[in-house]
């Protein structure tokens, strides 16, 4: 697993809709793989974490003055949709093939 | 106070000399980059433009902090700055050098 010592990467995060109270409106699936971005954004920032210029600058400052600024953060930079069967405002079961922004596709340093 | 520690943009002045970039950036000598600081606690405020994934992660963290970490306060919109720099030894002016300063922070 990706602990604080490891580099920014995508790790598994199974989300059960009942656990977060979303089973009241999401009929299916019961759970899904949301993934999570974990790990540190260490200098030098690798190309695969697609750092912005600001993230590079922040990382350089953190390297020289750790108390002045925090490290860049490992976050989702690209999300994927999942398919859900849910109850709409009228309580009618509705299938949404592409329910956007639910699962991590890529992680990066921001 | 929890509200004071909530995700927001804070000042961060960058001196190019301090990070060794004065070797290729001629002007300005530095700039206000800003930084995103603070926590992303549930419920995530609208102005932090949380993604569905960030909301779900915040909820999972709320239920079981061991299972998932909080969403992170990061730049969601960046702005350019103007720079005069050396490009292969040739002095070049770039009116819009993109992605250098934070204009908005959010929870991701």
């Amino acid at each position: 697993s990706a602990g604080a010592g490891s580099h920014c990467q995508k790790t598994s995060l199974r989300v059960n809709f009942e656990d977060i109270g979303w089973d009241s409106w999401i009929i299916a699936p019961k759970e899904y793989e949301a993934y999570e971005c974990k790990g540190g954004c260490f200098f030098p920032l690798a190309d695969d974490v697609t750092p912005t210029k600001h993230a590079i600058v922040q990382t350089l400052v953190h390297l020289k003055f750790p108390t002045k600024v925090g490290k860049a953060c490992c976050v989702p930079t690209k999300l994927s949709p999942i398919s859900v069967l849910y109850k709409d405002d009228m309580g009618v079961p509705t299938l949404k093939y592409h329910y956007e922004g639910m699962s991590v596709a890529e992680c990066g340093c921001r | 106070n929890a509200k004071g520690n909530y995700c927001k943009r804070t000042p961060l002045y960058i001196d190019f000399k301090e990070i060794g970039w004065d070797s290729w950036i001629i002007a300005p000598p530095g700039y206000e980059a800003y930084e995103c600081r603070g926590v992303c606690n549930y419920p995530l405020a609208e102005h932090l433009t949380p993604t569905k994934h960030a909301i779900i992660q915040a909820l999972v963290h709320l239920k079981n902090s061991q299972k998932a970490s909080k969403a992170c306060c990061v730049p969601t919109k960046l702005e350019p700055i103007s720079i005069l720099y050396l490009d292969k030894g040739v002095v070049t002016y770039k009116f819009k050098y993109e992605g250098m300063a934070v204009s908005e922070c959010g929870c991701r």
Partner: antibody, heavy 115, light 107 residues
Framework: QVQLKETGPDLVQLTQTLSITCTVS????????VHWVRQPPGKGLEWMGA???????NYNSAFKSRLSISRDTSKSQVFLKMNSLQTDDTAKYFC?????????WGQGVMVTVSS | ETVMTQSPTSMSTSIGERVTLNCKAS??????VDWYQRTPGQSPKLLIH???NRHTGVPDRFTGSGFGRDFTLTISNVEAEDLTIYYC?????????FGAGTKLELI
């Protein structure tokens, strides 16, 4: 439309401090750079310093440490402060927007240093 | 600092003539040179930016060229309103520096 307007005194006493405000409209100080240029009577243009859009500042070392440039982005104002004025500081002082070249200039403020 | 040497200091011409104004930098400034027109009583007016780019609304009789150290402003068909002072500016190094100016006058 884009406008820059300098406001400041016409007359400043020898050794005193000059303060000029450049108020801009039609553009943002976080997008464009604003520089200060002066022209003494019968002489050429002289660059004084720059307030860059990112908040960085450059000064012409010819003014040593007499010059100070600052801004208030929320009020769309850039400030020039120069102390220990001498008679050869008598000039027309301009603020100008720098994007691709100095494309917009203020009307300038003529400052006379008197003893 | 980069010294910008403008030549000639003054130039006599006739309406309809073609004139060339020169500017020489003491060190290479790439293409970072502008040309300005300064009419007494008015604020300076940008003609050319980045050595050769005509500013919006500037008549096409004004042409800029050059790279490195040598730059020129050409006015292909002088009109009465062009009889004024021209300055070059380099922004390839700090401090930015202007040339001393070229005064264009009628013969």
């Amino acid at each position: 439309q884009v406008q820059l307007k300098e406001t400041g005194p016409d007359l400043v006493q020898l050794t005193q401090t000059l303060s000029i405000t450049c108020t801009v409209s039609g553009f943002s100080l976080s997008t464009y750079n604003v520089h200060w240029v002066r022209q003494p009577p019968g002489k050429g243009l002289e660059w004084m310093g720059a307030m860059w859009n990112g908040g960085g500042i450059n000064y012409n070392s010819a003014f040593k440490s007499r010059l100070s440039i600052s801004r208030d982005t929320s009020k769309s104002q850039v400030f020039l402060k120069m102390n220990s004025l001498q008679t050869d500081d008598t000039a027309k002082y301009f603020c100008a927007r720098f994007g691709y070249g100095f494309d917009y200039w203020g009307q300038g403020v003529m400052v006379t240093v008197s003893s | 600092e980069t010294v910008m040497t403008q030549s000639p200091t003054s130039m006599s011409t006739s309406i309809g003539e073609r004139v060339t104004l020169n500017c020489k930098a003491s060190q290479s400034v790439g293409i970072n040179v502008d040309w300005y027109q300064r009419t007494p009583g008015q604020s300076p007016k940008l003609l050319i930016h980045g050595a050769s780019n005509r500013h919006t609304g500037v008549p096409d009789r004004f042409t800029g060229s050059g790279f490195g150290r040598d730059f020129t402003l050409t006015i292909s068909n002088v009109e009465a309103e062009d009889l004024t002072i021209y300055y070059c500016l380099q922004y390839g190094s700090i401090p930015l520096t202007f040339g001393a100016g070229t005064k264009l006058e009628l013969i």
